[in-house]
Interface confidence: low
Amino acid sequence: SAPGEDEECGRVRDFVAKLANNTHQHVFDDLRGSVSLSWVGDSTGVILVLTTFHVPLVIMTFGQSKLYRSEDYGKNFKDITDLINNTFIRTEFGMAIGPENSGKVVLTAEVSGGSRGGRIFRSSDFAKNFVQTDLPFHPLTQMMYSPQNSDYLLALSTENGLWVSKNFGGKWEEIHKAVCLAKWGSDNTIFFTTYANGSCKADLGALELWRTSDLGKSFKTIGVKIYSFGLGGRFLFASVMADKDTTRRIHVSTDQGDTWSMAQLPSVGQEQFYSILAANDDMVFMHVDEPGDTGFGTIFTSDDRGIVYSKSLDRHLYTTTGGETDFTNVTSLRGVYITSVLSEDNSIQTMITFDQGGRWTHLRKPENSECDATAKNKNECSLHIHASYSISQKLNVPMAPLSEPNAVGIVIAHGSVGDAISVMVPDVYISDDGGYSWTKMLEGPHYYTILDSGGIIVAIEHSSRPINVIKFSTDEGQCWQTYTFTRDPIYFTGLASEPGARSMNISIWGFTESFLTSQWVSYTIDFKDILERNCEEKDYTIWLAHSTDPEDYEDGCILGYKEQFLRLRKSSVCQNGRDYVVTKQPSICLCSLEDFLCDFGYYRPENDSKCVEQPELKGHDLEFCLYGREEHLTTNGYRKIPGDKCQGGVNPVREVKDLKKKCTSNFLSPEKQNSKSN
């Protein structure tokens, strides 16, 4: 197991006294119900805590909520319930926090049955003050902020109306009726689906997709026969019903729905689904469900237009529509994703890709671990990671995998070592190189979080008993110190730290239970005195990401370039600080066939980097649908991987000719689109 507090581990000096001086308890004057916590802004230290308590009476449920505010990262809280007139806040809508550092907050209140509309409380000064506003409708969804302008809000009503506000919720206007789903796009554009006949459910597959770019002054119908739509990166996707049967296909647009192309993906039937697993401005990961109730499907990765797709991973675990998938973007290293597959014997295995879905492999067995009972060969096995699916199956897994963009290379996850995921109690594993190698970090299940951009990792044992001990590591999980943060143990409910992992404060939430009452309590621990000094240049070391063959001049090349990072030495106990910026130096690589995906009509045989023509298309003209026109493709089978920056080296030729013929297969051709104004 990983070294604990032994001779290999240098202890942090006088840490008990240092942490005791920086541990702040707050007992909330509340009966225990539910508690939700939101951070307002970045690096502001402002936290809002909403506690709610339901008392079920004979004929109705009586509810009470309280609102608390901290402006010092949770060390002290002030009851500000009076600012919202002691109103009961609806927890299902949560606290709608504005984008970036806008300081905007919207709380949706519970109103009595006969009221004309709902009620919200609005703040634009980081919750110092609130304004009560009565709504002309009853909200069905939480208020959604435009990513570009936090004064613009949209919401759906219980009557399926689409309501928009241009002045941060002060005044509302219904811009369309019969709306099923609405989303903000870029440039304050709103996309939404409408039904013409009975309802959203009855018209599924016959919905229309609309767009407004001026907050409801004018509209354009950009799609018909729509089943659903989604936005990912710069792509707009719509699943569209086929003319002749009940199947549907994905269509994609990169110009906000003005023109559409049919994605080269399998069609799906009534019981199947598509799911955008991840998307950025370069490409998209798309899951296509298998026919039947298999619980798995296939991951495809797109080209830069979202049109041509390469098969990435078979038997990808994804239970049902809106169900569970373990697909995880490892944000601490470019190109890395982890997910689960359902193998032929129905066991679940973890797979990892380091090149954005190009190749998937098993996770390397941690050197300090034995293969468990699932392993046929006790010397050969892999690490398998517990994620959403394990949590949904109520395994003893308190947290999903964790990574942070500014804690380069660090991934923390629960897992087991064998041939497949085990239902036994998992341990916690850490990778410091983005998933290439792993080490057992902690025995048994834990809650964990990353502070100070990886300078500190904090963990709390997952236990049904009350706890009063927190563990922390200043060397990326190699060595651990334990700190008793309270004399009286509490029933632990969660760890909270400011999103972005830049903070040095951690809040431990829980409740105390006595004979008559139970109360919410939080302990906020500031680790600033553990990391006594600011990190200097000597505290950092050079690290080449994705390095697997150190002799190769192409070592570290992923998607056409390699990156060298400055990383904190494990032995350095110092503060990265709130202003820490990841230092990286990119370097362009020569192109090889690995930098290209197979073009339309081509595929890669297993264990081969060359793209070969699909047998059924050999000798045929390659024609496919692009922007509603037939295109003729002259290609030698390769197309550069989206986001790949390689230069020189191998350079396959491709050319697309416009055949000036209309596609019969494109249900979203421009002719079928129309515009109207309010």
């Epitope: 050079i542 080449l544 150190p550 002799e551 190769d552 001049y553 070592d555 130096q585 370097s587």
Partner: antibody
């Protein structure tokens, strides 16, 4: 002390051959990529060739490709440059240089350098 | 191939002067640039790597800056032992590795 010492230079006729050697000491030779860089009289520096720590990866400048061969013997802590079909424009001081960082970091900063050996190609 | 252009090709300066040498890459090389000092009859010596990182043992009067295509080597207060020729080198991890034409710093 880290040291690189070149040898094998001299006067050779055009079309002739020469083999340069570089003896390394004071560091773990087998962990570093090695390089040859040359400098014509009164001119600037020109990279010639590189070889990875266990000879898996070898690179040449276009001007010498097909004529020069870089090699190494890790057991003897030695680097070599076999030069065939020599031309007048190959006249230069040839330096042996180590990559600044060991295996895993190929950023091509050269440190240290040997003192150089002069190769003169003349009839 | 990436071409490296150094300017000026020579500079005359006195002890105590501030000297600035520039190097331009024909295409962006991020921070993959090194500076070397070479004295007559001697081998080059690494001064700066990764555009601005000072090689250990090099006096702090030498500094480097720049990123992309334009880079600068500055000697804040010229010392007698600094009279030499200075070369920039693009250190992108792909061969060919290319050097600038050199800048000779002479005594005024």
């Amino acid at each position: 002390e880290v040291q690189l010492v070149e040898s094998g230079g001299g006067l050779v006729k055009p079309g002739g051959s020469l083999r340069l050697s570089c003896a390394a000491s004071g560091f773990t030779f087998s962990s570093y990529s090695m390089n040859w860089v040359r400098q014509a009289p009164g001119k600037g520096l020109e990279w010639v060739s590189s070889i990875s720590s266990s000879s898996s990866y070898i690179y040449y400048a276009d001007s010498v490709k097909g004529r020069f061969t870089i090699s190494r013997d890790n057991a003897k802590n030695s680097l070599y440059l076999q030069m065939n079909s020599l031309r007048a424009e190959d006249t230069a001081v040839y330096y042996c240089a180590r990559d600044r960082l060991g295996r895993g970091y190929k950023w091509n900063w050269f440190d240290p350098w040997g003192q150089g050996t002069l190769v003169t190609v003349s009839s | 191939d990436i071409q490296m252009t150094q300017s000026p090709s020579s500079v005359s300066a006195s002890v105590g002067d501030r000297v600035t040498i520039t190097c331009r890459a024909s295409q962006g090389i991020d921070s993959w640039l090194a500076w070397y000092q070479q004295k007559p009859g001697k081998a080059p010596k690494l001064l700066i790597y990764a555009a601005s990182s000072l090689q250990s043992g090099v006096p702090s009067r030498f500094s480097g800056s720049g990123s992309g295509t334009d880079f600068t080597l500055t000697i804040s207060s010229l010392q007698p032992e600094d009279f030499a020729t200075y070369y920039c080198q693009q250190g992108n991890s792909l061969p060919p590795i290319t050097f600038g034409g050199g800048t000779k710093v002479e005594i005024k």
